[in-house]
Interface confidence: low
């Protein structure tokens, strides 16, 4: 046997060459013929009416042909013969790939609320062999759940993914990708999540700068709410108490002007949104104000006074449940 | 053998919108990105975008967001980009380019290029 | 971004001599193990042309006096020996990610 071919492996419109190569030649006849036998080259004549063909190299060692826009109907055995005696005969099988012809992702809901599952699908349609898919969120793979449908040696392949969302997960792509042997790189789609989540409260003491609140001082907190959607309402309640009356409420600002020892108590800012509500606490405590020395007569002293500052926040970030979490700054 | 025709040299005024073509041939149309480099007399080459013929899939370069809208028409095997709000500074040549790559991988680089369309801004 | 910075800004060689193109990427653009640097060619009214893809393989139809090289952030085009068609604008360009984007551009000229 001198007779000599290679399969071949190509994607679904490209080139496939098909090379019928003899070892040692004695010029006889080559002939190329498809899977139903019909003749496609004999040496440099073509009988086969299909322009797809062309002659690449006609020689009496190599008979090499082109397949231009291979389809699926070109896969099979194709037939090297060589008109030796006894004649010689060999073949190539030609394997066709084919991409997805799309990728389409379909999100149960467009907007989730946290701690909600939600189903994302992603359907690779039409390809050959069967698309693996491969789940991403953000840059973490996640695992799905895939059904492949077969049809006239086509694979439509869907994978299901079951994904419990966090507030975290905003804006973060949920990305399908797709592993195929006619698709080089990356090929995938995605869509980006869209979480809502209850507000997250955080009180700022802007003034005094220095956080020690002294009688007659001023005091200005602001409440910085942050949720999806945008809370709706921030409000300021004094708790078990009212609110001092010379106390000026502006938006997410609380001023107390003028402080005084009846003005200790503990202030919270209250946001909600439609997801739910959080609220947390400042602890006021009003210190009496800086005691003038008169100035010595005959004796010097020297004296050290060292003052503590007290900045005591608590924070409740979990709906309708009294503040438990304390965070304290001495 | 893969060719990309542009259309020809546009002549716009400040505020006008103008849309270029760029028809292929000689491969699948639908089966390869076609992105869009744009280059400013005597500068550099800059990458506005890519669609994907076959889902109209577009990603942008964001500094050309809000000022190229990327389109195809896989009918007629032809990739347009339309310029908004022009000014002077969008006056360049224009490149449509197919990627040299099977189906859509991003990792990738500038097979075959257009011979490019003069966009002139003046009032 | 993705900032390339191509040296020099220019330069000149004489006929037959060798030219030697940097490419410095802001980040790697290396992933598992291939580098997505590529370089192209452009004359002027021209479009550019692809001489070298994934960091050092030769275009078919391209002279193999071009010869590209380089890993991670660190290209090289090198055009060896330099012949009077070369003379051009060259940009080393990045497929690592979005946007991707072109160096700067050395411009060649031969004496």
């Known amino acids: 046997q001198n007779l000599f071919t290679k399969d071949v492996t190509v994607i679904e419109g490209e080139v496939a060459t098909i090379s019928c190569q003899v070892n040692k030649s004695d010029d006889s006849v080559i002939q190329l013929l498809n899977p139903n036998r019909q003749t496609i080259y004999f040496r440099d004549f073509r009988p086969l009416k299909d322009s797809r063909f062309q002659l690449l190299n006609f020689s009496s060692s190599e008979l090499k042909v082109s397949l231009t826009n291979v389809s699926i109907s070109d896969e099979g055995r194709y037939f090297c013969q060589l008109y030796t005696d006894p004649p010689q005969e060999s073949y190539t099988t030609i394997t066709v790939l084919v991409p997805p012809r799309n990728l389409m992702i379909d999100i149960q809901k467009d907007t989730a609320v946290e701690g909600e599952e939600i189903e994302v699908n992603c359907t690779a349609m039409a390809s050959k062999p069967a698309t693996t898919i491969r789940w991403f969120k953000g840059n973490t793979e996640l695992k799905g759940k895939s059904e492949v449908e077969e049809w006239s040696d086509m694979y439509t392949v869907t994978s299901q993914l079951m994904l419990k969302v966090h507030k975290e997960d905003d804006g973060v792509p949920v990305i399908c990708q797709v592993e195929h042997p006619a698709v080089t790189g990356n090929l995938q789609t995605q869509r980006y999540l869209e979480v809502q989540y209850k507000p997250q409260v955080h009180i700022q003491m802007t003034y005094p700068l220095q956080g020690l609140t002294r009688e007659g001082d001023a005091l200005e907190l602001t409440c910085e709410a942050i949720g999806k959607p945008q809370p709706v309402m921030v409000t300021w309640v004094r708790v078990d108490d009212e609110m001092p009356q010379h106390a000026v409420l502006s938006g997410p600002n609380l001023f107390i002007n003028n402080l005084n020892k009846t003005d200790n108590g503990t202030y919270r800012c209250e946001a909600s949104n439609i997801v739910g509500k959080a609220h947390s606490d400042y602890m006021l405590y009003v210190y009496d104000p800086p005691t003038t020395i008169p100035p010595p007569t005959t004796t010097t002293t020297t004296t050290t006074t060292t003052t503590t500052t007290i900045l005591t926040i608590i924070t409740d970030s979990r709906a309708g449940e009294e503040g438990s979490i304390r965070a304290v700054d001495h | 053998q893969v060719q990309l025709q542009q259309s020809g040299t546009e002549l716009a005024k400040p505020g006008a919108s103008v849309k270029m073509s760029c028809k292929a041939s000689g491969y699948t149309f639908t089966h390869y990105w076609m992105h869009w480099v744009k280059q400013r007399p005597g500068q550099g080459l800059e990458w506005i975008g890519f669609i994907n013929p076959g889902t109209g899939y577009t990603e942008y370069n964001q500094k050309f967001k809000d000022k190229a809208t990327l389109t195809a028409d896989k009918s007629s095997s032809t990739a347009y980009i339309q310029l908004s709000s022009l000014t002077s500074e969008d006056s360049a040549v224009y490149y449509c380019?197919?990627?040299?790559?099977?189906?859509?991988?991003?990792?990738?680089?500038?097979?075959?290029w257009g011979q490019g369309t003069l966009v002139t801004v003046s009032a | 971004d993705i900032v390339l910075t191509q040296s020099p800004a220019s330069l000149a060689v004489s006929l037959g001599q060798r030219a030697t193109i940097s490419c410095k990427a802001s980040?790697?653009?290396?992933?598992?193990?291939?580098?997505?640097m590529n370089w192209y060619q452009q004359k002027p009214g021209q479009p550019p042309k692809l001489l070298i893809y994934?960091?050092?393989n030769l275009e078919s139809g391209i002279p193999a006096r071009f010869s590209g090289s380089g890993s991670g952030t660190d290209f090289t085009l090198n055009i060896h020996p330099v012949e009077e068609e070369d003379a051009a604008t060259y940009y080393c360009?990045?497929?690592?990610?979005?946007?991707?984007?072109f160096g700067g551009g050395t411009k060649l000229e031969i004496k």
């Open positions: 980040q790697s653009v290396n992933y598992d193990g291939d580098n997505y």
């Open positions: 360009q990045q497929s690592y990610e979005d946007p991707w984007t």
């Open positions: 994934a960091a050092s």
């Open positions: 380019s197919r990627a040299s790559y099977y189906s859509g991988s991003s990792h990738a680089w500038f097979g075959f």
